[in-house]
Amino acid sequence: GCRALEETLMDTKWVTSELAWTSHPESGWEEVSGYDEAMNPIRTYQVCNVRESSQNNWLRTGFIWRRDVQRVYVELKFTVRDCNSIPNIPGSCKETFNLFYYEADSDVASASSPFWMENPYVKVDTIAPDESFSRLDAGRVNTKVRSFGPLSKAGFYLAFQDQGACMSLISVRAFYKKCASTTAGFALFPETLTGAEPTSLVIAPGTCIPNAVEVSVPLKLYCNGDGEWMVPVGACTCATGHEPAAKESQCRPCPPGSYKAKQGEGPCLPCPPNSRTTSPAASICTCHNNFYRADSDSADSACTTVPSPPRGVISNVNETSLILEWSEPRDLGGRDDLLYNVICKKCHGAGGASACSRCDDNVEFVPRQLGLTERRVHISHLLAHTRYTFEVQAVNGVSGKSPLPPRYAAVNITTNQAAPSEVPTLRLHSSSGSSLTLSWAPPERPNGVILDYEMKYFEKSEGIASTVTSQMNSVQLDGLRPDARYVVQVRARTVAGYGQYSRPAEFETTSERGSGAQQLQEQLPL
């Protein structure tokens, strides 16, 4: 723990005038001027009534104010003469003395009160020297520290009982211990007095140091009986925009050009690419002009920008469909979430005077029109002989942050003659054991003159297709077998080629013994 603080309540070492303590009887302890080890003048008390037996000499200090202290420490410096070195003395010679104290709410003691005895005086300890000295030696100074408590009154007296020693009380110091104010875990703990017992732990509440925030509570530190801190509970940590300094006793603001996004003990970091700070204590660096962070980007990610346009858009027109392909933009803006949008515009009028407007909703984009990851799209259901402009936009996660529209590459195309659309419905006119007679409506969008129709059909059980052509919108399928199910599809042909097959329609031949009577029936797709 941290080093303990000691505060003096009384110290004879600094008293140069008479101490004038009370002694009983007067023939006992005697105040004498002397010198300490450094030859400073000091006031001491001596007693040496060793030739008479049954000694009971008391010495009492002046009143000492407690100052809210619960436990007091007493440091005694003294010398004791070795009984064996004194000739012709009775066996009552002692080499120890007793330390007492007495509590009072004011300076009430007198020459006769309290009575000179244990109880009312409270015994602290019998003090024995580590070393005693003979007459021929220099006096060997012993130092002893004792403590007592808990104290509750305004002050106290110390008392010393001699029972036949030859000794000198060189200095007496009464003091108490406290834990010094300290900083631990980015929290400040105030100076705290020790408790009443040596084993006491006194709780000191803490407060976070400036620019720190609590990370676990309660914030407390325990001050033990020796004035040392122990068992920290709770902690603070540096707030965003601040970093630890001076061995975790300070949280210093991040200098300009650096930031700290999260609270904690990490250091401030230089701003990510394309960002800056203009003031200290930044928790995020702001992006340079035309650079942005997406909502999903963390504070420690670089600022990025929008991609440049796609390159090399190539169109491959096939009648009223086309395939667009392109290459990646030269500059991805520093991101890897690139997507493409394809904007379709239908143009009217000629040359420079043409006006373009958004395409109809029925134009189909495969795999999709917006949010393409592929650099290829198939576009169909366009009008024949029509001019279109396609804009291929490059976008990324910060395109929505930019005030400017996405950058794009445009391509102009003109559609060709379209193949006819699908034949809508097939109608059964008659069936027999070996034939089916079918008719159909022409396509809704023939896109030109229909040259002929091709019919594909197969027996469902066999599954092998045959084809026939017809210049009319009806046909008789021969060579079939009775009681069999057939699937039939038709498509129209113009100079632009074949259209799509109609959806599969199903018909059944009659049994061989059946009449083959006409069964007029419109057959919608399966």
Epitope: E462, I464, G479
Partner: antibody, heavy 113, light 112 residues
């Protein structure tokens, strides 16, 4: 392209039933009959029956009536053949086919205790 | 049931030569609609059967033109011109005139 996916192998106890599956893709499922054919180890081919997925019409070889039941699930484009009261004689490779032109890889059924 | 007979269980052939595989039916497979409902399949080792010829003489899609089919109402022949190693397997004839559909016992083509 047309695909008929069948599990590679199935092991079943004698007396039990087993439902073999045939998942079709790459064509309009309801436009073609599904045929089932049996081939015993080292033997020739035996036609079991056919089913029309559009209306569940079935045609069985008399020999397999009571042994095989053909069904389809249009929503998953899957045809099934349930074989009941299995014996060692039913151990064989069972093929499904789209019409007679495209065949699956077959499921090897082993009936053993 | 119509019985399909493949008299030759196996036919040995030298690669590059041609070979004919016969098949006979117990009833005429010629329908009144003009089609003969006879089909040929090849089953290569470890594989499922593959359609070669449909309605006696029509080549199925994707089948090399060295395969051809011919016959009358009850006697049929599959001819392979210039046999190749990949033609090895068992050849089955099948009738689809009546139910149940029936197969011949198969003829194994072996290279000499």
């Amino acid at each position: 392209q047309v695909q008929l996916q069948q599990p590679g192998a199935e092991l079943v106890m004698p007396g039990a039933s087993m439902k073999l599956s045939c998942k079709a893709s790459g064509y309009t499922f309801t436009s073609y009959y599904i045929h089932w054919v049996k081939q015993r180890p080292g033997q020739g081919l035996e036609w079991i029956g056919e089913i029309d997925p559009s209306d569940f019409y079935t045609n069985y070889n008399q020999k397999f009536k009571g042994k095989a039941t053909l069904t389809v699930d249009k929503s998953s484009s899957t045809a099934y053949m349930q074989l009941s009261s299995l014996t060692s004689e039913d151990s064989a490779v069972y093929y499904c086919a789209r019409g007679i032109s495209s065949w699956g890889q077959g499921t090897t059924l082993t009936v053993s205790s | 049931d119509i019985v399909m007979t493949q008299a030759a269980p196996s036919v040995p052939v030298t690669p590059g030569e041609s070979v004919s595989i016969p098949c006979r039916s117990s009833k005429s497979l010629l329908h009144s609609n003009g089609n003969t409902y006879l089909y040929w399949f090849l089953q290569r080792p470890g594989q499922s059967p593959q359609l070669l010829i449909y309605r006696m003489s029509n080549l199925a899609s994707g089948v090399p033109d060295r395969f051809s089919g011919s016959g009358s109402g009850t006697d049929f022949t599959l001819r392979i011109g210039r046999v190749e190693a990949e033609d090895v397997g068992v050849y089955y004839c099948m009738q689809h005139l009546e139910y149940p559909l029936t197969f011949g016992a198969g003829t194994k083509l072996e290279l000499k």
